[in-house]
Structures are given as structure tokens and as C-alpha cells.
Interface confidence: low
């Protein structure tokens, strides 16, 4: 048999608490438990779950809680089910609600000396406890002519009179706690003494120069006083009026008017009115001086057709807030169709050419018309007007390429060799329109060119291939003057290219033979064995059959080249004393010589005292000193050759002789002693 | 009897600092604005600067001649405004008025009803 | 800034005459525009305030008319007492700006 060792049992509860309702089963077979609440089964939810047995809710919840709960144990297998006791919730809640007017129907129906009867919506179990308040402070029972029963959530004023007004509060409590409406009821009473407006000024917003009218009523038993101040809190009547209100003028039935509105007359206007009794019921309302500032420019805009774009018009800054539209042509746009206005854009759908054009935005308030102009262009794909061709372009001279095309916007042209862009440099030139110019053309020029046309609409190409007609010129061009060495083998160079391959041959200027033992090569002129009579003036002459011939002068001289007779040796000199380096060169023109002294030539105008180039080309420096120290170079040069050698210079400190050595010892290193 | 007495001028240096006072009575003086106006000797009136009332948070403006050297301040409990004058220039001698629309504390008063006896300020090294 | 130009700087008439002083304002300054005179010694003192209207007090002998830019004081017979610097003095916008003032002197 099933046996409930715990059953539920009935207990308190609160609102939004934790609770638990317990079961324990013992039985010979397998049961599983299930709860019923009012006869149904409980469904698990995060708010109310089994734990074992047991029922536990983490959130007692006053609605879904409320009624039966059953624990139910069943043997599946022999079908035994057993039932425990009955258990519910005894729920302690408190739900803040509204005062609200029960007594009479409507506001409209409170008048002075009727019954008004408020009711505090706090609900609540056990049942609260209610307390009432006017602007804050506590009310008790019978107190200022009001029935009240602080256990009762109806309050009532009887009868009710001016004295009453005021903010209705109610707070209650209970077991579970406290709480307070949780919307206030204001009661106005008017005293029919008390100023109760009846027409409130609004504020305006005139344009300089316009008028202003401030309307402003309130109505009490006896008439209330009503008087107008501006800013400074100084009256504005029609007998004495502020300076610069001058133009202010309030009629009879309390309504200001200002007229010419000029800037200082912008500002708060307060229109008071006192009754016989009551504070003073001050309403406010502020002039503004219209405004509208200047519009941003718009850039120009290219659209490419069948898109859709938009423009947007930043409206001007102003007050009031200026209105927007869009104008083409002198008509105002649509706000649907294919080329509309949309709130402050310009919507121009499925874009076509016709839509090009200038269109305005404007904006407008009461201060005046501000507008801006957009110039709209329709891209449209780039034209051949001429198209580049292949071309055969001479060497030396300019060579033009063209790609003429048209379209909107105008197109930009970019040029390709080689598939390399050509950016512009000293021998590339694009023109305006898209025509290529290359300077000074080159053999390497002739290849493929490209040009590409484009605008956003799309783009065009075209390209070509330029042969370079080759002119008739030496490669490279002989030198005009030229050594030989005497007695030697020798051999002068001389090539040429042309559009056809030129033949080449040598003469001497003087329109003589070549001797026998120079011969002309191929274009090289060979001399077996240099002699004094091979010097003189040659002529190289390169011709072919399209372009005629051209010729190269050369001027040979024959030379003894240079060889040094003696040359400067490391030398080691004491500091003070003087240095010789020696240096003679022979060869045929005689060679001059010159020195360079630590990386720079020694200028023999400009030596100074202590040093001198003989006419033999030794150098010579007096009372050396450290400084002198470093490589000299000896360079000799003649009009067809130059050799150097070189050599160091170190300066030393002079020993003093130790007592070992003898007057006579030697020094450790080659000395020159003066 | 409305009344406006300036005082505090007198002798300073170029470059030196004086406060100018001025004194008021027989009218509102805490809601009305006040304005300080000067002339050099055989010269034409010259508009120093004004300070408003508190209802206008005490807003003050300023010649462009004097702005940033000259700061006009005003102490309601005692009905008094202040020209507080910092490194003057020898330009800046003059006979120095306070003046006031009398009931206005407005920037645009018509004209001025009241008008001080005036204090000498000399700039002089 | 609005500038106030005044003209002449000075004259001289005799009693009974009728004497006019103009003022120029650099902008439209509507009415916004006073008169005062200053006599040697004494502070300034308002004849006519917004251009054209006489404040309490001041001899009717004395008149303003014109707007926006142009305006004119006329004294229609001058009297010994009426020696004195005579100013323009606008009061439509900060800061507030006088004229250069005009001498009139009895021959």
C-alpha cells in the first residue's frame, strides 16, 4: 500500500515570496507523484516546480496560486493511486492603484458646497489599513468639516469648499506591508474671489516690423486685475509704457499688441491676474523674432542613368523651423513619381539624360526665403569622335596618338603601353582631349598603346601599335678626338644603324687613301703599327640607299703615353723637418704634373710657404707637422692619357737618444734628416 | 529725489587700475539697469558699458574700447554699481558718469533720466 | 558698431532764430533716437526721446523729427539760455552710440 509519510498542509503565504508545499511517499513498488491544483494537473514552470515530492514555488503569485493543491502518488504498475489531504494558501498582498473621483460623476461637476467623495484603489489581503493626504500633510477624522474613516478607502469632503484644494494622496498597509496610490488626485475648488484664467497667452513668432498679439483672459467674482510685464518685470500699460514699448497697446479685454516688432522687443511677457482673494495667477508666454540663416552650398552632383539618387537639402537654421521643397525649372516637385521630393530629398529614380539640369532647394519661414542651387549632370557613356591608329612615328621627332570621344561629363582619357599606365612625364603629354604626344620618340617607343575613356557611366578602348621609323645616326657616335699609341696596334671604332643597315667606311679628311698598313674593317679602322704620320684628321661616312649618308670627323693624334721615371716612396719624416716626395713622368705630349695631399688637389697658386712644386714635379713641404701625415698622390696627364702613384707621409716625433745607443745608431724606420 | 553719486577718480598711472562707485537712491535701483558713460575734456559723449539686473542675471556688455580692461559689477544691498578700470591708457582720461533709465532694467532704455555729477579719472605718467 | 554723424559741429545765431541740427545714422535705426543737451560743467540732460517726442518739462520751442536714418532738432527761436553742446544719441542696437555733438553759440 501507498503510505504519505509527510503530507501538505495549509499555511500563510506572501505576495512574491518562496514557499513549500510537501509530500513524502513510501510504498513496495515504483510510484511516480504528481500535484493537482482544483483538480488539474500542475504543469512545471520556472515560478512553480516539483522538488522530489514536494511542491515548491519560488514566487508565491496571489492569482495563479489561489485555490486546492493535492499530492498524488501512483503505482503505474498495479494501478494503486493515493491522495493527501487538501492544502491551499492563505496569500497576504498589497497592490498600490489610483485616487480616483467617486463622487460626483465628473470634475466638471465639483462646485463649491457639493459633496466630493474620493476612493483610494489599494487593494490588499488581509484587508489594509488606509491613511489620507492633501499636499502631503495627513488628514484625520473630522478634521476641517471632511468625513473621513482612516479605515474606510473612501474619503469625504462635505461640503467642499476652496480650503480643500489640493493634491489627494493615500497610502495603506496591511500584514503583507505598505503602499501609496500610485496616482494623485488634484481638487481645484475655485473660490469665485480667486483669478481663473480663462484664455492663456501662447507664444508667437513674428517677423521684424509685423505685430504681435498676446491674448489673455481670467475671470473671479468681484473682476480680477490683470497687468502685463515684460522681462524686467516693468508694467506695460497704455498710460505708461517701457521706452521700447512704446508700440504696446492692451485693450479691454486683456489682450497685448504689440506692433513694428523690433528685436528688443523679443523676450518672456507675463500677464498676471489677481483676484479679491488668492495668490496671483501668472501665465508666461515669449515673443520671438523670426530668423533664417544662410543655406550650405551644394557641390555638383553626376549621376549615371538608370540609378536611383538623392539629393538632401540641409534646411537653414531658423525659427520657426523653415520649410523645405525642391524646385526644377520653376515648378515645384512632386512628393511621389520618378523624380519627387521626399521629406528634405530630392529622389530622382531610374535616372534618363532629360533629368539633368539645375534644381533648387528652397526654404522659407516667416523671417524670408533662403535657396541653393544643385547642378545635376547625367553621366553618359564616352564616344568615338577618332580613334588611335597604328602609326609609324620617326625617331627624334614628336609622335601623335589620338582618342577623340565625347559624352557627359567630359570623358578622361588614360593611356597604356605596354599594359603599363603612362603617367606624364618630361617625353609623355596627354592633352585635353585625350590625344597622346610622346617627345623626342625613341626606338623602344614603337609597341602597343591603349587609351581608355571613361566617365561614371562607363567606359570606352581602343588601341594601336607604333612602328618607329629609325633615322640614319652612329652607335654610338665616335668620339672627335682621339689617341693612338705611337708604335703600338691600334683601332678605331665606328657603327651606324639606319631603317635599312648602312655600310660604313673611313677616308681621311684631306680626301687621301689609307696607307697600306691601316685598313678599314667593317667599319673599324686598324692601324697594324701606330707611326708619327697616322695623326690627322679621319672621316667616317654611314650611308644607306632611303637615307642618304652622314658623316663623323675624327681627329687622331699619335702619342708617347705616359710612364713614370721616378716615383714618391713611403716616407717617414721627424716633425719640423722637411719632406721630399719625387715624382717625374715622361711621355709624348710631355705630361704635366700635379699633387693631390689628403684627398685634394694641391693648387700650386695656393700652397703657401712651406710648400713647393719643383719644375721636375717633386714636392717639397717645410717644417712638417702631424697634420701632413696621409697619402700623397703624384698625377701626371697629357692630352691623351693620365696615370698616378701614390705613396705615404708620416710625421714623427723626433726620440730623444737613450744612453745605450750610440751618437751614431741608426733609426728603426727609412728617415729623410735635413 | 533721485539721486546718482560717483566717486573713486582720480590720478593713476598708464597701465594702473581704479574702481569708480556710484552711489544710488530715490528709485529701484535693483531692477534697474545701469550704464556708465564717459567724456574727455572738449570731446563727445563715449557709452562705457551697462550691467543689468539680477532678473536678467546680471548681464553686462561693453565699448569695444574698454572690453576686456574695464568690468562693470553692482551690489543690490547697497544700491551701488562699480567700474572696476584695469591697465588704463592715457585715452581712457575722462569725466566718468553713471546713468540709469530709472525704472528700466532694460538694454534699449530709451534715454537716460538720471545722470551723476560725474568723477575725473586722469591717465598720466 | 552703428555710427551717429552729426552736422554742423558748431554754429552761431542770433536770439530769435531758428536753429537745425541734423543726424545720420550708418543703418536703418527706425525711431530709436534722442536729443540731449549738455551744458558746460553739468551732465546731459534728454529733450526728446524715440526722435520725436518732447520729454516732460522741455520748452516746446524745441522739436525732432525723422526715421529710419535721417533725423533733425530744431530749436524754432533760439533763446540765450539755450548755449549749449546739443548730442544725437541712438539707442537700436549695443552699444549705444552718440553723435559728435554740435556747439551752438549766440552771435
Known amino acids: 500500500a501507498i503510505v504519505f509519510i509527510k503530507q501538505p498542509s495549509s499555511q500563510d503565504a506572501l505576495q512574491g515570496r518562496r514557499a513549500l508545499l510537501r509530500c513524502e511517499v513510501e510504498a513496495p513498488g515504483l510510484v511516480h507523484v504528481y500535484w493537482l491544483l482544483d483538480g488539474a494537473p500542475v504543469q512545471d514552470t520556472e515560478r512553480r516546480f516539483t522538488q522530489g515530492s514536494s511542491l515548491s514555488f519560488a514566487a508565491v503569485d496571489r492569482l495563479q496560486d489561489s485555490g486546492t493543491f493535492q499530492c498524488v502518488a501512483r503505482d503505474d504498475v498495479t494501478g494503486e493511486e493515493a491522495r493527501s489531504a487538501n492544502a491551499s494558501f492563505n496569500i497576504k498582498w498589497i497592490e498600490a492603484g489610483p485616487v480616483v473621483l467617486k463622487h460626483p460623476a465628473s470634475e466638471a461637476e465639483i462646485q463649491p458646497q457639493t459633496q466630493v467623495t474620493l476612493r483610494c484603489h489599494i487593494d490588499g489581503h488581509p484587508r489594509p489599513t488606509y491613511q489620507w493626504f492633501r499636499d502631503g500633510t495627513p488628514l484625520s477624522d473630522g478634521q476641517s468639516n471632511n468625513t473621513v474613516s482612516s479605515k474606510e478607502r473612501n474619503l469625504t469632503l462635505r461640503p467642499a469648499g476652496p480650503e480643500h484644494s489640493g493634491l489627494y494622496s493615500c497610502c495603506a498597509h496591511n500584514a503583507f506591508g505598505q503602499a501609496c496610490s500610485s496616482q494623485n488626485f488634484t481638487l481645484s475648488i475655485a473660490d469665485e474671489s480667486f483669478a481663473r484664467v480663462v484664455l492663456a497667452p501662447q507664444d508667437v513668432i513674428v517677423a521684424r516690423n509685423e505685430e504681435a498679439m498676446f491674448h489673455c483672459q481670467f475671470s473671479a467674482q468681484p473682476p480680477p486685475n490683470l497687468q502685463w510685464l515684460f522681462e524686467d518685470e516693468t508694467p506695460i500699460t497704455n498710460r505708461s509704457r517701457p521706452p521700447h514699448l512704446r508700440r504696446a497697446t492692451v485693450f479691454a479685454n486683456g489682450s497685448l499688441l504689440l506692433t513694428q516688432v523690433r528685436p528688443r522687443n523679443a523676450g518672456v511677457y507675463r500677464c498676471i491676474g489677481q483676484g479679491q482673494r488668492g495668490p496671483p495667477v501668472i501665465l508666461e508666454a515669449t515673443l520671438h523674432l523670426a530668423e533664417i540663416e544662410d543655406m550650405p552650398l551644394f557641390e555638383p552632383r553626376v549621376f549615371t542613368a538608370g540609378s536611383e539618387e538623392r539629393v538632401t537639402c540641409l534646411p537653414p537654421k531658423g525659427l520657426p523651423e523653415p520649410s523645405v521643397w525642391w524646385e526644377h525649372a520653376g515648378v515645384r516637385l512632386p512628393t511621389h513619381g520618378r523624380v519627387y521630393q521626399k521629406g528634405h530629398e530630392l529622389v530622382l529614380a531610374s535616372i534618363a539624360e532629360s533629368d539633368a539640369g539645375v534644381y533648387t532647394c528652397h526654404a522659407a519661414n516667416l523671417a524670408g526665403q533662403r535657396r541653393q542651387d544643385v547642378n545635376i549632370t547625367v553621366a553618359t557613356v564616352p564616344t568615338w569622335l577618332k580613334k588611335p591608329q597604328d602609326s609609324q612615328l620617326e625617331e627624334g621627332k614628336p609622335g601623335y596618338l589620338h582618342c577623340l570621344t565625347q559624352a557627359t561629363p567630359k570623358p578622361t582619357v588614360v593611356w597604356y603601353r605596354n599594359q603599363m599606365l603612362i603617367s606624364e612625364d618630361s617625353r609623355f603629354e596627354v592633352f585635353k582631349n585625350g590625344t597622346l604626344r610622346i617627345n623626342n620618340v625613341e626606338v623602344y617607343d614603337g609597341t602597343w598603346y591603349r587609351c581608355v575613356s571613361s566617365t561614371p557611366a562607363g567606359s570606352i578602348e581602343a588601341q594601336a601599335r607604333v612602328q618607329v621609323l629609325e633615322k640614319l645616326k652612329f652607335t654610338p657616335p665616335p668620339q672627335p678626338q682621339q689617341c693612338m699609341e705611337f708604335d703600338k696596334e691600334a683601332t678605331v671604332p665606328c657603327s651606324a644603324t639606319g631603317r635599312e643597315k648602312p655600310t660604313i667606311k673611313w677616308e681621311r679628311a684631306d680626301g687621301s687613301s689609307l696607307p697600306e698598313w691601316v685598313t678599314d674593317n667593317a667599319g673599324t679602322l686598324h692601324f697594324a703599327r701606330v707611326t708619327r704620320d697616322d695623326a690627322g684628321n679621319y672621316t667616317c661616312i654611314a650611308s644607306n640607299g632611303p637615307q642618304g649618308q652622314i658623316r663623323a670627323h675624327v681627329q687622331l693624334t699619335v702619342a708617347v703615353f705616359i710612364t713614370f721615371k721616378v716615383e714618391p716612396e713611403r716616407t717617414t719624416v721627424y716633425q719640423g723637418h722637411t719632406a721630399l716626395l719625387q715624382c717625374e713622368a715622361q711621355g709624348d705630349p710631355k705630361p704635366l704634373i700635379q699633387w693631390k695631399g689628403k684627398d685634394r688637389i694641391l693648387d700650386p697658386t695656393k700652397l703657401g710657404p712651406r710648400m713647393h712644386i719643383f719644375q721636375n714635379g717633386s714636392l717639397v713641404i717645410h717644417d712638417v707637422a702631424p697634420e701632413d701625415s696621409g697619402r700623397y698622390t703624384c698625377i701626371a696627364g697629357n692630352s691623351c692619357n693620365i696615370k698616378h702613384t701614390e705613396a705615404p707621409l708620416y710625421v714623427v716625433d723626433k726620440p730623444v737618444p737613450e744612453e745605450s745607443e750610440g751618437p751614431g745608431s741608426p733609426p728603426p724606420y727609412k728617415m729623410i734628416q735635413t | 529725489e533721485v539721486q546718482l553719486v560717483e566717486s573713486g577718480g582720480g590720478l593713476v598711472q598708464p597701465g594702473g587700475s581704479l574702481k569708480l562707485s556710484c552711489a544710488a537712491s530715490?528709485?529701484?535701483?535693483?531692477?534697474?539697469?545701469m550704464h556708465w558713460v564717459r567724456q574727455a575734456s572738449g570731446k563727445g559723449l563715449e557709452w562705457v558699458g551697462r550691467?543689468?539686473?539680477?532678473?536678467?542675471?546680471?548681464?553686462?556688455a561693453y565699448a569695444a574700447s574698454v572690453k576686456g580692461r574695464f568690468t562693470i559689477s553692482r551690489d543690490d544691498s547697497k544700491n551701488t554699481a562699480y567700474l572696476q578700470m584695469n591697465s588704463l591708457k592715457t585715452e581712457d582720461t575722462a569725466v566718468y558718469y553713471c546713468?540709469?533709465?530709472?525704472?528700466?532694467?532694460?538694454?534699449?532704455?530709451?534715454?537716460?533720466?538720471?545722470w551723476g555729477q560725474g568723477t575725473l579719472v586722469t591717465v598720466s605718467s | 558698431d552703428i555710427q551717429m554723424t552729426q552736422s554742423p559741429s558748431s554754429l552761431s545765431a542770433s536770439v530769435g532764430d531758428r536753429v537745425t541740427i541734423t543726424c545720420q545714422a550708418s543703418?536703418?535705426?527706425?525711431?530709436?533716437l534722442n536729443w540731449y543737451q549738455q551744458k558746460p560743467g553739468k551732465a546731459p540732460k534728454v529733450l526728446i526721446y524715440?526722435?520725436?517726442n518732447l520729454e516732460t518739462g522741455v520748452p516746446s520751442r524745441f522739436s525732432g523729427s525723422g526715421s529710419g536714418t535721417d533725423f533733425t532738432f530744431t530749436i524754432s527761436s533760439l533763446q540765450p539760455e539755450d548755449i549749449a553742446t546739443y548730442y544725437c544719441?541712438?539707442?537700436?542696437?549695443?552699444?549705444?552710440?552718440f553723435g559728435g555733438g554740435t556747439k551752438v553759440e549766440i552771435k
Open positions: 546713468t540709469s533709465r530709472g525704472y528700466s532694467g532694460y538694454d534699449y532704455s530709451s534715454y537716460f533720466d538720471y
Open positions: 530715490g528709485f529701484t535701483f535693483s531692477g534697474s539697469a
Open positions: 550691467i543689468r539686473s539680477k532678473a536678467n542675471s546680471y548681464a553686462t
Open positions: 543703418q536703418d535705426i527706425s525711431n530709436y
Open positions: 524715440d526722435a520725436s
Open positions: 544719441q541712438q539707442y537700436d542696437n549695443l552699444p549705444l552710440t
